[in-house]
C-alpha cells in the first residue's frame, strides 16, 4: 500500500488500538502484525493468537473479526511503526496496512516561573514569564489566557512577556500545556506581585517617613485632596497591591485578600486616597508606593512611604551590685535593661547622670554616696521613638547597717 | 519648670510657606516632645503633629501630612514647625506644647508656648 | 483622624458640678487610656487640667476630675467658681503617636 501510515496516539499507562478495516464476510487465512523490531503476532481464524514478543506479553491482543490490534499498559517503547500483513484465503496478493504509535504522558500541571523583571520608563515593567511541565520535552504546546496586547509569547508560547503599570489590573494569567493526549492549566498566576517597585526608585515625590506602634493603627498619606475624582489609585508595598477604584470600596488585590497578614487589616481610604493599617505588625515596615492612575491606566504620580515600627516599651529592670562599702561611702553598680527594646532605645537617669554608659542595649552606672549623706533616689527611663517607661531605684537599704563591708 | 517661647506674628501670602520656631529654656530638651497645635480664630484647637528630639523622629496629622514638617536643633534647644502652600484657613494662633512628665507615651502637652498668629492674605 | 465630640456649651451657678463629655471611638478613646482635659481663657494658651483620664498636675485643683466609660471620656467641675468659665477642650491619644482634639465646649458660669 501506498497510503502514508495511519498515526494513532496513546497515553503512557493506557491502551490504543491499531484499527484494521476487514469486514465480517472476508474470509483470512492470517494476519502477521510486525512491530517497531520484528514480528510481533501471528493470528487465524478459530486459532489462538500467537505473541512472540516477550515485552507485549499480557498487553497484546488482536479482536476476533477484524484482527485489529490492541495493546494495554503502553510503554514508551511501543512507540513507532506498525504492519499488519493481511493474507486472505484464495488471495494470493498480501495486503499491508501500516500504522504509526506515538505515545505520550498525561501531562502534569504546567509550573509558571518568573524568569526577569525589567523597569522600564513611565513606572512600568516588563515581566517575563515561563511555563514548563515536567518530565515533558517534545510535542508540548502552550497558550496563555488572557490574550492581550502588550503581552507577547515566544519559544513556542512557553515564554510570556507582559508589559504593565500598576494601574492596569491586576489580571491572572494561566499558561495551558497540551499535547495530543491531553491538556492542563497552571494555577493563575498575578504577575503585580512581580513588579512592585516600578520607578519607585527613580521617580515620584521624596519618600516620607511614618512612625508606627506595633499592634496600634496607622495611617500612610497620599495627601491627595481630589481623591474621590481619581480614576484608581494602588498602593503597593512587597508583593501586595491594595487599590481603590473610582465608586468602589477600596479592595485588596483577591490574592491578598486570603492572605492572612493583610486580611481585613488593609484599606484604602475613600476619602483621601491614604493607606490605613489597623494592628500593625512588625513585618509590615518598609517602603510603601502609591500610584495615581488615569483613566487610560498611566500613572499621573506616584508617592513613597517608609513605615517604620516600633513596639512600646515594657517597664526596665534595673539591677545593682555592691561594689565596696567602706570609709563610710558606699559604692554601687547600677544596670538598666529593657527586655524586647531593640537598638533604638535609649536610657537617661534622673536626676542627671553623665557617667552613664550604654553598652549592649543596657545602661550602667556608677554610684557613690557618704553615709551621712542622703541616698540617692535614682529614676532609669528607657525611651524609643514611641514610648517611654521608667524605673526608680531606691537605694536607702543596700549599705545600711554599722561598718557593712558586705560584696 | 520649662518655659517655651514662639517666635512673632507673620503674614504670608497664599501660596508661600511659613517657618514658626519654639525655644525651650530651663529643662532637658532633648528628653521631651514637642507638640504643635493651631486655632484658628474663632474655632477649636487641631493637633498638627510633634517631634521627639533625642530621637529626631516626627509624627503628623493626617491632615497635615505632606504639607508640614516639624524639625527639631538639639543644640539650640529649638523646634521649628514650617506649613506650605499655605491657604487663607491656614490663618490660625499656632501654639507649641511639650511634655514635661516622662509619660509612657509623647506627646502630653504640659507646658504650652504663647502662640504665633500666622496670617495667610494676598 | 476626626475630631472627638463635645457639647457646644455647658452652664452651671457657683457651687454647682458640671461635667463635659468628650465622645470618640474604639480607635482613640476607647482604645487607650491616654486621655486629657485642657482648660483656655480666652487670648490665653491652653492650660493641661487632667492627664490619662483621671490624674491631676500639680497646682490643678481637686475641684476638676476626669473619668472614662467605653468610647466616652468625661471632666467634672464641681464647687463652680467664676474663674473656671472658660473653653475646655478633651485630646486623646489616636494610636501610632497622634492625637486628636475635642471641638471644644464653653463653659459659662451664671
Known amino acids: 500500500k501506498d497510503s502514508a501510515p495511519t498515526v494513532v496516539s496513546g497515553i503512557l499507562g493506557g491502551s490504543v488500538t491499531l484499527p484494521l478495516n476487514i469486514s465480517v464476510d472476508t474470509e483470512i487465512e492470517n494476519v502477521i502484525w510486525i512491530g517497531p523490531k520484528n514480528a510481533l503476532a501471528f493470528a487465524r481464524p478459530k486459532e489462538n493468537v500467537t505473541i512472540m514478543v516477550k515485552s507485549y506479553l499480557g498487553r497484546l491482543d488482536i479482536t476476533k473479526w477484524s484482527y485489529s490490534l490492541c495493546i494495554s499498559n503502553l510503554t514508551l517503547n511501543d512507540a513507532g511503526s506498525y504492519k499488519a500483513q493481511i493474507n486472505q484465503r484464495n488471495f494470493e496478493v498480501t495486503t499491508e496496512e501500516e500504522f504509526t504509535l506515538f505515545v505520550y504522558e498525561q501531562l502534569q500541571e504546567p509550573q509558571v516561573t518568573m524568569k526577569s523583571v525589567k523597569v522600564s520608563e513611565n513606572f512600568s515593567c516588563n515581566i517575563t514569564l515561563m511555563c514548563s511541565v515536567k518530565g515533558a520535552e517534545k510535542s508540548v504546546l502552550y497558550s496563555w489566557t488572557p490574550r492581550e496586547p502588550h503581552a507577547s509569547e515566544s519559544n513556542g508560547g512557553s515564554i510570556l512577556t507582559v508589559s504593565r503599570t500598576p494601574c492596569d489590573p491586576d489580571l491572572p494569567y494561566i499558561c495551558t500545556a497540551q499535547n495530543p493526549v491531553s491538556q492542563r492549566s497552571s494555577l493563575p498566576v498575578h504577575v503585580g506581585q512581580f513588579c512592585t517597585d516600578p520607578g519607585a526608585s527613580r521617580g515620584g515625590t521624596t519618600g516620607e517617613t511614618v512612625v508606627g506602634v506595633l499592634g496600634e493603627p496607622v495611617t500612610l498619606p497620599l495627601a491627595l485632596p481630589a481623591c474621590r475624582d481619581t480614576e484608581k489609585v494602588v498602593w503597593l508595598f512587597n508583593t501586595s497591591i491594595i487599590s481603590k477604584e473610582r465608586e468602589e470600596a477600596a479592595t485588596a488585590d483577591p490574592l491578598i485578600k486570603s492572605r492572612d497578614p493583610y486580611k481585613n487589616r488593609v484599606w484604602v481610604s475613600s476619602q483621601d486616597c491614604s493607606l490605613k493599617i489597623s494592628q500593625l505588625k512588625i513585618e509590615d515596615a518598609g517602603p510603601y508606593h502609591a500610584y495615581v492612575c488615569s483613566e487610560a491606566s498611566s500613572v499621573t504620580s506616584m508617592t513613597h512611604v517608609t513605615l517604620l515600627i516600633y513596639r512600646r516599651l515594657r517597664k526596665p529592670k534595673i539591677t545593682w551590685s555592691l561594689r565596696h562599702s567602706e570609709d563610710g561611702i558606699c559604692r554601687i553598680s547600677l544596670t538598666c535593661s529593657v527586655e524586647d527594646g531593640g537598638n533604638t532605645v535609649m536610657y537617661t537617669w534622673t536626676p542627671l547622670q553623665k557617667e552613664a554608659v550604654v553598652s549592649q542595649g543596657e545602661s550602667h552606672l556608677n554610684v557613690s554616696w557618704r553615709s551621712s549623706e542622703n541616698h540617692p533616689n535614682l529614676t532609669c527611663t528607657a525611651s524609643n521613638p514611641v514610648s517611654r517607661s521608667s524605673h526608680q531605684f531606691l537605694s536607702e537599704n543596700i549599705c545600711s547597717g554599722p561598718e557593712r563591708n558586705t560584696k | 519648670q520649662m518655659q517655651l517661647v514662639e517666635s512673632g506674628a507673620e503674614v504670608k501670602k497664599p501660596g508661600s510657606s511659613v517657618k514658626v520656631s519654639c525655644k525651650a529654656s530651663g529643662g532637658t530638651f532633648s528628653s521631651y516632645a514637642i507638640s504643635w497645635v493651631r486655632q484658628a480664630p474663632g474655632q477649636g484647637l487641631e493637633w498638627m503633629g510633634g517631634?521627639?528630639?533625642?530621637?529626631?523622629?516626627?509624627n503628623y496629622a493626617q491632615k497635615f501630612q505632606g504639607r508640614v514638617t516639624i524639625t527639631a536643633d538639639k543644640s539650640t534647644s529649638t523646634a521649628y514647625m514650617e506649613l506650605s502652600s499655605l491657604r487663607s484657613e491656614d490663618t490660625a494662633v499656632y501654639y507649641c506644647?511639650?511634655?514635661?512628665?516622662?509619660?509612657?507615651?509623647?506627646?502630653?502637652?504640659?507646658?504650652w508656648g504663647q502662640g504665633t498668629l500666622v496670617t495667610v492674605s494676598s | 483622624q476626626s475630631g472627638l465630640t463635645q457639647p457646644r456649651s455647658v452652664s452651671g451657678s457657683p457651687g454647682q458640678s458640671v461635667t463635659i463629655s468628650c465622645t470618640g471611638t474604639?480607635?482613640?478613646?476607647?482604645?487607650?487610656?491616654?486621655v486629657s482635659w485642657y482648660q483656655q481663657h480666652p487670648g490665653k494658651a491652653p492650660k493641661l487640667m487632667i492627664y490619662?483620664?483621671?490624674k491631676r498636675p500639680s497646682g490643678v485643683p481637686d475641684r476638676f476630675s476626669g473619668s472614662k466609660s467605653g468610647n466616652t471620656a468625661s471632666l467634672t467641675v464641681s464647687g463652680l467658681q467664676a474663674e473656671d468659665e472658660a473653653d475646655y477642650y478633651c485630646s486623646s491619644y489616636a494610636g501610632s503617636n497622634t492625637f486628636v482634639f475635642g471641638s471644644g465646649t464653653k463653659l459659662t458660669v451664671l
Open positions: 506644647a511639650a511634655d514635661m512628665e516622662l509619660r509612657d507615651y509623647y506627646y502630653g502637652m504640659d507646658v
Open positions: 474604639s480607635s482613640d478613646v476607647g482604645g487607650y487610656n491616654y
Open positions: 490619662d483620664v483621671s
Open positions: 517631634i521627639i528630639p533625642i530621637f529626631g523622629t516626627a
